[in-house]
């Protein structure tokens, strides 16, 4: 079952997700999506990193941590009730079926 995180309407929500890079800057692609983690990739992607940098995001979604050291925790700004639901953090480790998948449940009060 998903770990549950709470935030209040109008506040920022924080959804933690971490991995350990082989070396700082030697990154593994990560995606964040709205909805449970599918078989591959992320559905409804809101933010993505590649081996170099954060390469895609939409308004209100950003990384507040040191992502080049593996802190890919997602911040969602100024949340509304519509932001409630499951979010997927997927660490896209090279190789077959190596991905680490985390489903996080966001509850907005």
């Amino acid at each position: 079952s998903e770990v549950e995180y709470r935030a209040e309407v109008g506040q920022n929500a924080y959804l933690p997700c971490f991995y350990t890079p082989a070396a700082p800057g030697n990154l593994v692609p990560v995606c964040w999506g709205k909805g449970a983690c599918p078989w591959s990739q992320c559905g409804n992607v809101v933010l993505r990193t590649d081996e170099r940098d954060v390469n895609y995001w939409t308004s209100r979604y950003w990384l507040n941590g040191d992502f080049r050291k593996g802190d890919v925790s997602l911040t969602i700004e100024n949340v509304t009730l519509a932001d409630s639901g499951i979010y997927c953090c997927r660490i896209q480790i090279p190789g077959i079926m190596n991905d680490e998948k985390f489903n996080l449940k966001l509850v907005i009060k």
């Epitope: 700082p24 800057g25 170099r52 995001w57 939409t58 308004s59 950003w62 700004e77």
Partner: antibody
Amino acid sequence: QIQLVQSGPELKKPGETVKISCKASGYTFTTYGMSWVKQAPGKGLKLMGWINTYSGAPTYADDFKGRFAFSLETSASAAYLQINNLKNEDTATYFCARKPPHYYVNSFDYWGQGTTLTVSS
Amino acid sequence: DIVMTQSPATLSVTPGDRVSLSCRASQSISDYLHWYQQKSHESPRLLIKYASQSISGIPSRFSGSGSGSDFTLSINSVEPEDVGVYYCQNGHSFPYTFGGGTKLEIK
């Protein structure tokens, strides 16, 4: 293509107020922060701070707290720098520069052309 | 604030030379170091990010290296249009300070 277009040169007297604009085009304005950088004549670059274009929350470097204010007109994809109670040492070129919102992504990939401010009595 | 120190202040080179510009941070900033070029009467332009990552549209003769507190910008074969001032920037800790710049001149 992505562009940041700033307002024209300004000549002001000490004690006056100036408001410099930076109009963005070619990308979704609220997905990037906007930074302001000062360059005094013949000197290097100094970051003044930046503004979150989604929330409007500004962050000021210590040397630019008090007389300086960042603001937005989101509907016009525009950011503004206002300097109050102008001093001679405010004479400089001011640049706006695009910054991703992520805390550890602090390179500036697009810059305005600069606005020259001259403060003289 | 982290202090960024660049050397030399001025570099006079001949077209075709390979040159190295140095930048030192007053404390470790990992690889959060960015390089900019500013030509006379122009805005700065991002050349390299994260110490060594290339930027789309920037000629391949520009490269960066280093980590921690010591960094280098290299220009493999200087061309006349490379004249200008080169700035390094601390991208690790606010207020993301810039170095004082290295002025590149052509002999």
